[in-house]
Amino acid sequence: STGAGSHCQKTSLRVNFEDIGWNSWIIAPKEYEAYECKGGCFFPLADDVTPTKHAIVQTLVHLKFPTKVGKACCVPTKLSPISILYKDDMGVPTLKYHYEGMSVAECGCR
Amino acid sequence: STGAGSHCQKTSLRVNFEDIGWNSWIIAPKEYEAYECKGGCFFPLADDVTPTKHAIVQTLVHLKFPTKVGKACCVPTKLSPISILYKDDMGVPTLKYHYEGMSVAECGCR
C-alpha cells in the first residue's frame, strides 16, 4: 500500500474474522494481528526495504517521468503463519498450527 | 503500482539506461523492456493475480473499512534476468549473461 509522507514500513492491522465473514468457519482466534505494509517507496530506496533491481530501476524512471511511471509499491515480502481452530467440512473443530501467509513478517519495495 | 480502472496486469515499460544514469557503466543494451505492474487489486481477487492469504484478508478489510486500510498492491511477483555488457573498474567491457531481477515476468496482488 502507498502512504503519504512516511517511508515503507510494517504497521499494525488488527483483523476481526467477523468483519470479513470468516467467523463462519474459523472458531478461534476471534481476531489476529495481520499487520499492513504502509508508506512510500521514495528515492533513494534504503537497504531495509530490500529493493529488487527492478524496483530500483522503476524508482529511477519515476524520478525522471513521474506522471508516466509509478513508484515501486510497499508490500509484504515475507509472511508468517498463525495457528487457527476451524470447522472442517463435517463441522468438526480442527487445529491448524501453521496456517501460512496470514501475517506480515517483513515489508519491502517492489 | 496502482491504476485507475484496470485490474492488475503487466504493461510495457521501455527503460533507457541513459535516462536513469546507468549508461555510465552499462555499455549495452542501450535500453530494455523492464515492464511495469499496473492496475488495481479489486475484490474479488482473481486467481491470475496469485493472491496470498494476507492479500485476500487485506482486500476484505479494505472492503469493510476503505478509509482505514488500503487495497493490496499490484507488484512484480516473478522477475527475469537480462544479459548486459558493462565496464569494470578498469573500463574493460565484461559480460553478465544472467543479470537478475531486471524485467517483470509476472505481476500479482500483494
Epitope: - | 534476468p81 555488457l85 573498474d89 578498469m90 567491457p93
Partner: antibody, heavy 114, light 110 residues
C-alpha cells in the same frame, strides 16, 4: 591488455579427476563473473558453468551434464579461476575455455580415455 | 538439438553480403538477449556483436538484427579472413547461463 591463460588439461582415465586453472590479468578479476565453456572435438560451444563475484555472493551455476561432478571456484588474491572436474566421462573430452563472455582464453585440452 | 537453431553452413564470394540466421525454439530464451561470436580456424571464440555494441577490432562490416523469434548476423563485403564458425548465444533462464546455437560454418568461395 586482457589475458586469460588456461592450464591443467591432459589425458585422464574415465572416473578420474582433473583441476583446470585460468590465470587472469588486465581487468578487475574480483568483480567479474567468470564462466567455463567447452568445445568437444569438431563440435560447437557448450557452457559448463559460472561463478559470480564474491561481492555478489560468489554463487555458482552449472549446466545439467556436469552438475554434481564439476566445481568452479576462484581465488581473487591470485586472479585465478579453477574448474575441479571429478568422475570424468569420455563425453567430457573437449577444449575448455575460461571466459568473461567478452574475452576468452586460448583453451586447454582435456582428453578422457581408457 | 540446440534451442537456438542456426543453418550448419553458409557461403559467399568475396565482396558479397551474407546473412546467418538464429531462431529461438524455446520459451526460456528471450530473443532480446541473443548475441554473436566468431571462431576463426584454430582460435578461441571472440565476441562479435552484443546488441548494438561491436567490440573494438571488430569490423563494421558485421551487423546484427532481431525480429520476432529470430536474430540475424549480416556480413557485407565478404573477405577470405571471415571464413570460420559463427555462433549465436542467448540467455537460458532455466539454465541460468548462456546457451549456444549449433554454429554456422562460413565458407568464402573462390
Amino acid at each position: 591488455e586482457v589475458q586469460l591463460v588456461e592450464s591443467g588439461g591432459g589425458l585422464v582415465k574415465p572416473g578420474g579427476s582433473l583441476r583446470l586453472s585460468c590465470a587472469a590479468s588486465g581487468f578487475t578479476f574480483s568483480n567479474a563473473w567468470m564462466s567455463w565453456v567447452r568445445q568437444a572435438p569438431g563440435k560447437g560451444l557448450e557452457w559448463v558453468g559460472r561463478i559470480k563475484s564474491k561481492t555478489e555472493g560468489g554463487d555458482t551455476d552449472y549446466a545439467a551434464p556436469v552438475k554434481g561432478r564439476f566445481t568452479i571456484s576462484r581465488d581473487d588474491s591470485k586472479n585465478t579461476l579453477y574448474l575441479q572436474m571429478n568422475s570424468l566421462k569420455t563425453e567430457d573430452t573437449a577444449v575448455y575455455y575460461c571466459t568473461t563472455g567478452t574475452y576468452w582464453g586460448q583453451g586447454t585440452l582435456v582428453t578422457v580415455s581408457s | 538439438q540446440s534451442v537456438l537453431t542456426q543453418p550448419p553452413s553458409a557461403s559467399g564470394t568475396p565482396g558479397q553480403r551474407v546473412t546467418i540466421s538464429c531462431s529461438v525454439t524455446n520459451t526460456d530464451i528471450d530473443i532480446f538477449n541473443v548475441h554473436w561470436y566468431q571462431q576463426l580456424p584454430g582460435t578461441a571464440p571472440k565476441l562479435l556483436f552484443f546488441h548494438d555494441y561491436r567490440p573494438s577490432g571488430v569490423s563494421d562490416r558485421f551487423s546484427g538484427s532481431k525480429s520476432g523469434t529470430s536474430a540475424s548476423l549480416a556480413i557485407v563485403g565478404l573477405q577470405s579472413e571471415d571464413e570460420g564458425y559463427y555462433y549465436c548465444a542467448g540467455l537460458d533462464e532455466a539454465m541460468r547461463g548462456p546457451v549456444f546455437g549449433g554454429g554456422t560454418k562460413l565458407t568464402v568461395l573462390g
